[in-house]
C-alpha cells in the first residue's frame, strides 16, 4: 500500500501541539527547477490566476495520493513537499482512518 511505497516523516514540534505525520511524494529529478506562486487559500481580495503561469508540478493530492485520506481531505504542503490529511470530525491518524 501507500504506506509501504512512501516514507512517512514525523513532524515534531512544540509539546502542546499534536505531532502529525506527513508523507513525502517521490522526487523527480526535473522538479528541482520548478517554481510556484500558486495561492492555496481563498480570501477576499485574494489573488487571481496570474501567478499560476510557472506552475509545473502537479498536486500529488490529485494524483498518487488521490485516495490517501480515508476520512478526510488531502492537503499538499508546498513548503514541506509533503502530503497531510485534514480529518473529518471524530477521525484522526495519519490517513484519518481511526475513530
Amino acid at each position: 500500500g501507500l504506506n509501504d511505497i512512501f516514507e512517512a516523516q514525523k513532524i515534531e514540534w512544540h509539546e502542546s501541539v499534536r505531532v502529525e505525520q506527513v508523507v513525502k511524494p517521490p522526487q523527480n529529478k526535473t522538479e528541482s527547477e520548478n517554481t510556484s506562486d500558486k495561492p492555496k487559500r481563498k480570501k477576499k481580495g485574494g489573488k487571481n490566476g496570474k501567478n499560476r503561469r510557472n506552475r509545473k508540478k502537479k498536486n500529488p493530492c490529485n494524483a498518487e495520493f488521490q485516495n490517501f485520506c480515508i476520512h478526510g481531505e488531502c492537503k499538499y504542503i508546498e513548503h514541506l513537499e509533503a502530503v497531510t490529511c485534514k480529518c473529518q470530525q471524530e477521525y484522526f491518524g495519519e490517513r484519518c482512518g481511526e475513530k
Epitope: 520548478n34 510556484s36 487559500r41 513548503h79 514541506l80 485534514k86
Partner: antibody, heavy 125, light 112 residues
Framework: EVQLQESGGGLVKPGGSLKLSCAAS????????MSWVRQTPEKRLEWVAT????????YYPDSVKGRFTISRDNAKNTLYLQMSSLRSEDTAMYYC??????????????????WGAGTTVTVSS | DIVLTQSPASLAVSLGQRATISCKAS??????????LNWYQQKPGQPPKLLIY???NLESGLPARFSGSGSGTDFTLNIHPVEEEDAATYYC??????????FGGGTKLEIK
Amino acid sequence: EVQLQESGGGLVKPGGSLKLSCAASGFTFNSYAMSWVRQTPEKRLEWVATISTGGSHTYYPDSVKGRFTISRDNAKNTLYLQMSSLRSEDTAMYYCARHGYLLYDGYYEWYFDVWGAGTTVTVSS
Amino acid sequence: DIVLTQSPASLAVSLGQRATISCKASQSVDYDGHSFLNWYQQKPGQPPKLLIYAASNLESGLPARFSGSGSGTDFTLNIHPVEEEDAATYYCQQSTEDPPYTFGGGTKLEIK
C-alpha cells in the same frame, strides 16, 4: 546548537552579480523550508526568496523575480542566493532564516524561528 | 499584496508599565479560524528574534510578559511589565501560504 551563518556579501557595482551562501548546522536541514530576508538601511524588513525542503518550489517577490535565484544543497546543508542585475535598492543586510512550523489538523503554520547573523550587500558605483 | 501597518512608529514606556503595539493588515490573515501573524524583536546589531507565532503563541523559553492577541486584520503585541532589556524594534509578519510574505514597518520601543 542550531545555527545559520551567511557569507558572500560585499561591495558590487550596479548591474553586477553576487552569490550569498548560508551554512546550516544543528538541525535536519532538509526538513525545513528556508528563506532569505533583507533589511534595508532604513531598517525595513523585506522578504526576498523562499525554497521548499527539497528545492522543488521557489518563491520570490516581484521586486527580485528574474534577477535573484534561491537554491539549496541538502547534502552540504547550505542555502544559496544568486543575485544578478543588482540595483542600488538591493543594498541591505541579507539574512537567511529557517521556517519553523506547526502542523496539526491539516493546518500548516510557519514562521522564521532561526536567523543568521547576516551579511552586508552594498550596491554602489 | 497584504500590507501590514504598525503603530505607533515609536513609543516610550516607563519601567514596569505596559507597552502596546498594533499591527493592522490590509486584508484578513485568518483562515478557518487560524491567524497567520507573527511578531519579532530586534535589538541593534542583532538579527530579528521570533517572539510570538500564530498571533498568540509565545516562543519557547521567552518570558510570559510578552503576549499576542487579535484576529482577522487587527493584532496586538503587549509587553507587561516592561523591563529595560525590552528596548528594541518590534516587527509583525504575515505567514499565509500566499507570497509575498510581508513585514510591518516596525515599532521602536524605548524604556523611560
